[in-house]
Interface confidence: low
């Protein structure tokens, strides 16, 4: 069964800077990845970045750098300054659109006890969406 995993890490050097890593565990080819915060994309969440494996990347503040790590995983660095900066209990979600399986999404956040520089373990929590 396809899965999506999400890691959230607070950078030790910049306590208000976050790195989100997401990956897709499945056999299908990825057609689109959407990263959002505050909840799933389309369900109250706000889009931070859209990554298409062939056609490029869009990102919006406070996203600073979205990139592909592998053909099935991405990372996103968030700026940590200003009113729109993330906080420790912010939920981040990654949605992978994959043909022919459909869209799979998982969310994660920093565990309450996280030390700076440590990451939450991968949290696969796929939701099948027929969109």
């Amino acid at each position: 069964t396809p899965e999506v995993w999400v890691q959230v890490r607070m950078e030790a050097t910049e306590l208000s800077s976050f790195t989100i890593r997401c990956g897709f565990l499945g056999s299908g080819s990825i057609s689109l990845v959407t990263v959002s915060w505050g909840g799933p994309n389309g369900a109250g969440g706000t889009t931070l970045a859209v990554l298409h494996p062939e056609r490029g990347i869009r990102q919006w503040a406070p996203a600073r750098q979205a990139r592909w790590e592998t053909q099935s995983s991405i990372s996103l660095i968030l700026e940590g300054s200003g009113a729109s900066s993330p906080c420790a209990n912010t939920t981040f979600c990654c949605k992978f659109a994959s043909f022919p399986e459909g869209s799979w999404e998982a969310c994660g956040s920093l565990p309450p006890s996280s030390d700076p520089g440590l990451s939450a373990p991968p949290t696969p929590a796929p939701i099948l969406r027929a969109d």
């Epitope: 859209v50 298409h52 062939e54 056609r55 990347i57 990139r67 053909q71």
Partner: antibody
Amino acid sequence: EVQLVQSGAEVKKPGASVKVSCKASGYTFTDYWIYWVRQAPGQGLEWMGTIDTSDHKTSYNQKFRGRVTMTRDTSTSTVYMELSSLRSEDTAVYYCARDFIITVNYPVVDYWGQGTLVTVSS
Amino acid sequence: QNVLTQSPATLSLSPGERATLSCSAGSSVNYLHWFQQKPGQAPRLLIYSTSNLASGVPARFSGSGSGTDYTLTISSLEPEDFAVYYCQQRSSLPFTFGQGTKLEIK
């Protein structure tokens, strides 16, 4: 027939601003993003940024952050690129190109404007 | 930013010959696009997503590669192929182009 028609050549003084227009026709304007590329004389291509014509979102090359603004007018199917605080090194031909919207199939960047020469000189 | 380095800077060949243009990325990219530009004209998309021919592009053009190394090949040069060729990556922001390879008649 798909067409992107850009405004005419401009001569500007250092410190001034320039606003280049790109009028689209022959397709549904809001179905495609528009992106801007510039080319200094005898030089290569440089991506400046992209605007989503359907919801006005923009993504800029950080090199131009704070100086470039891309807007669109859906009533006239026109996209504008404004570059402020001009300097001599901004002298270039500025192109708009029709990009894809993320859910639409290929081709990628398949139509371009004819280019607008902006000369910055005191 | 991801710097794309094209080689050679200039390639001098005769019609009918095979042309091989290279593009090397500073860091790995998923896909690469190739554009052709003739003097006084806007660029024209040739190859998208590494190996796919854009609409109307002759079959003598082909693209290949992965990771950091990509190639554009023209199997048998026609007079209209002499131009400047640019590679472009869209795997990370800002999108970047190579500096170009000028293909000239020998």
